[in-house]
Interface confidence: low
Amino acid sequence: YDFTNCDFEKIKAAYLSTISKDLITYMSGTKSTEFNNTVSCSNRPHCLTEIQSLTFNPTAGCASLAKEMFAMKTKAALAIWCPGYSETQINATQAMKKRRKRKVTTNKCLEQVSQLQGLWRRFNRPLLKQQ
């Protein structure tokens, strides 16, 4: 999906009002310096691409993020504010329903959500220009 035409300010507002809190709740009990941010993004569409990938694509050691509160709110925000996004997700959602697994918070998931926090930061604050 091409995130170029999303309403970035509305997504930002959704993040600030709820998604950020859900990410913090998920990470509660984890030190902010425990994980190094290894994933980055260069502009807002790129950030949303990376956020979608980390949030909804199962990875080795962490298959359970898609049903977390922050993930569902992320999906809702993208569906509302990114034209045509929801249509691209129908097949992926049906496939996910079939292989829904027991919810387990692993260290790998915590690391992945830490990366997500970094990506959201960058999405919300494009880099200042060097003057």
Epitope: S20, R121, L127
Partner: antibody, heavy 121, light 105 residues
């Protein structure tokens, strides 16, 4: 625990320059922005500018362009502000304040204790 | 740049009273932050993003508003609330209001 430790009070002569520091600890220095804020005696807070330790990018209040220069040293997790051509108008307490943009709207959530600058001949 | 005007400049209240201070922006802003500052101390974040209380802030405080008008309300003032309160926006760079000094009678 997030801490911002600022350098001590300074007394300088008119026309001189001063460089103050703000050493950050308890978080990843390059993750968040650093603001600098001026407070003249008995007055309100005045935003000077902001710097991204991640890439050294800056944005200044128009009023302080040419007066203040913001820099960082990533290796020591320290932010600096240099003020030049000082006059009595620059006598104030200067605060550094971390801006956390992963929590409810980019607030300045931790502040240094302030550096007092007195300009007098 | 966006100018923030706070009123009143000085607010005098008795313990137990309800008080409201306002912050008006010269242009519409997305959110407003509030900080509390006591003499000789650094400002402390008090209300984040219009209505979210910072950690440790008593529930008698609340924030509201949108567009160009925002307010901070204390449902029942206590002696420890005596301080100066500043609003701050970041929709366009960052600016602070002139502050409202709350005095307890």
């Amino acid at each position: 625990e997030v801490q911002l430790q600022q350098s001590g009070p300074v007394l300088v002569k008119p026309g001189a320059s001063v460089k103050m520091s703000c050493k950050a600890s308890g978080y990843t220095f390059t993750d968040d922005y650093m603001n600098w804020v001026k407070q003249s005696h008995g007055k309100s807070l005045e935003w000077i500018g902001i710097i991204s330790p991640y890439n050294g990018g800056t944005s200044y209040n128009q009023k302080f362009k040419g007066k203040a220069t913001l820099t960082v040293d990533k290796s020591s997790s320290t932010a600096y502000m240099e003020l030049n051509s000082l006059t009595s108008e620059d006598s104030a307490v200067y605060y550094c304040a971390r801006e956390d943009y992963d929590y409810d709207g980019y607030a300045m959530d931790h502040w240094g204790q302030g550096t007092s600058v007195t300009v007098s001949s | 740049q966006i100018v923030l005007s706070q009123s009143p400049a000085i607010l005098s209240a008795s313990p137990g009273e309800k008080v409201t201070m306002t912050c008006r922006a010269s242009s519409s802003v997305s959110y407003m932050h509030w900080y509390q500052q006591k003499p000789g101390s650094s400002p402390k974040p008090w209300i984040y993003a219009t209505s979210n209380l910072a950690s440790g802030v008593p529930a008698r405080f609340s924030g509201s508003g949108s567009g160009t008008s925002y307010s901070l309300t204390i449902s029942r003032v206590e002696a420890e609330d005596a301080a100066t309160y500043y609003c701050q926006q970041w929709s366009s760079n960052r600016t602070f209001g002139g502050g409202t000094k709350l005095e307890i009678k």
